[in-house]
């Protein structure tokens, strides 16, 4: 799992891969600030709970994102 | 050199599988996702899906799911295509092509590999 | 899904001659956007991705521009080597969309 509480930041390693909108449990966003200088993005999959950082400055994960929000935006009223 | 070596072409009967391999070197085969293009003949190109290469995770167009399977050897850096039920409407070239994820475009592609589905 | 209407399917030129192809998306694709060459019997090549970045070792005579929905392609003198079909594609989205091709002869 690539994360760490002992670090400023919570991802130890990030991926520029993208995943299947539909596997994800939960997408946290977490902004920068004074603890870590970056935004981190950290997937939650569905299968086994298993937690991914992903890359912010990835196209192929602000595709992600952008898909996500767009499934978001349908399903609410 | 990035290279990616597809598999030789096949000829099989309807209702058979074929299973394509795409060998990779000269990268970490782990660091882009794999992307799946189909191209009938005289045809243009139709984008199938890609795997996720760090997670086995696929992920398929709609209208590519069902009979379509992607799958990984990360020992050999190796991404595999395999399309069951066979019809004649599957005959086509098929093609494994390298997302620059960062960017999210194909830089890299196999040479394609040949199916012909035949009675 | 976004849409990729590629024109014109077919084009006939002369050497020397400028050749311009277009792709319009059925939406704001934010200049993602790639060309690709294809020659008989071969992969697809990719020559520009974001509009108008030129990959290394493609010639400067290839070319591309365009915003919004409506991009070119542009080749600024046709030689020989060029006849090939070529094919757009958008990348702004998780699900990739290819135009539908142009082919490209020598008159």
């Known amino acids: 799992v690539p994360l760490s509480r002992t670090v400023r930041c919570t991802c130890i390693s990030i991926s520029n891969q993208p995943v299947n909108p539909r596997s994800l449990e939960k997408l946290e966003i977490i902004p920068a600030s004074q603890f870590c200088p970056r935004v981190e993005i950290i997937a939650t999959m569905k299968k086994k709970g298993e937690k991914r950082c992903l890359n912010p400055e990835s196209k192929a994960i602000k595709n992600l994102l952008k898909a996500v929000s767009k499934e978001r935006s349908k399903r609410s009223p | 050199e990035v290279q990616l070596v597809q598999s030789g072409a096949e000829v099989k009967k309807p209702g058979a599988t074929v299973k394509i391999s795409c060998k990779v070197s000269g990268y970490t085969f782990t660091d882009y996702s794999m992307h799946w293009v189909r191209q009938a003949p005289g045809k243009g190109l139709k984008w199938m899906g890609w795997?996720?290469?760090?997670?086995?995770?696929?992920t398929y167009a709609d209208d590519f799911k069902g009979r379509f399977t992607f799958t990984l050897d990360t020992s050999t850096s190796t991404a595999y295509m395999e399309l069951s039920s066979l019809r004649s409407e599957d005959t086509a070239v098929y093609y494994c092509?390298?997302?620059?994820?960062?960017?999210?475009?194909?830089?890299?592609w196999g040479q394609g590999t040949t199916v012909t589905v035949s009675s | 899904d976004i849409q990729m209407t590629q024109s014109p399917s077919s084009l006939s030129a002369s050497v020397g001659d400028r050749v311009t192809i277009t792709c319009k998306a059925s939406?704001?694709?934010?200049?993602?956007i790639a060309w690709y060459q294809q020659k008989p019997g071969k992969a697809p090549k990719l020559l520009i991705h974001y509009t108008s970045t030129l990959q290394p070792g493609i010639p400067s005579r290839f070319s591309g521009s365009g915003s919004g929905r409506d991009y070119t392609f542009t080749i600024s003198s046709l030689q020989p080597e060029d006849i090939a079909t070529y094919y757009c594609?958008?990348?702004?989205?998780?699900?990739?969309?290819f135009g539908q091709g142009t082919k490209l002869e020598i008159k």
């Open positions: 795997i996720n290469t760090e997670t086995g995770e696929p």
């Open positions: 594609l958008q990348y702004d989205n998780l699900l990739f969309t």
């Open positions: 092509a390298r997302n620059y994820d960062y960017d999210a475009y194909f830089d890299v």
């Open positions: 939406q704001d694709i934010n200049k993602y």
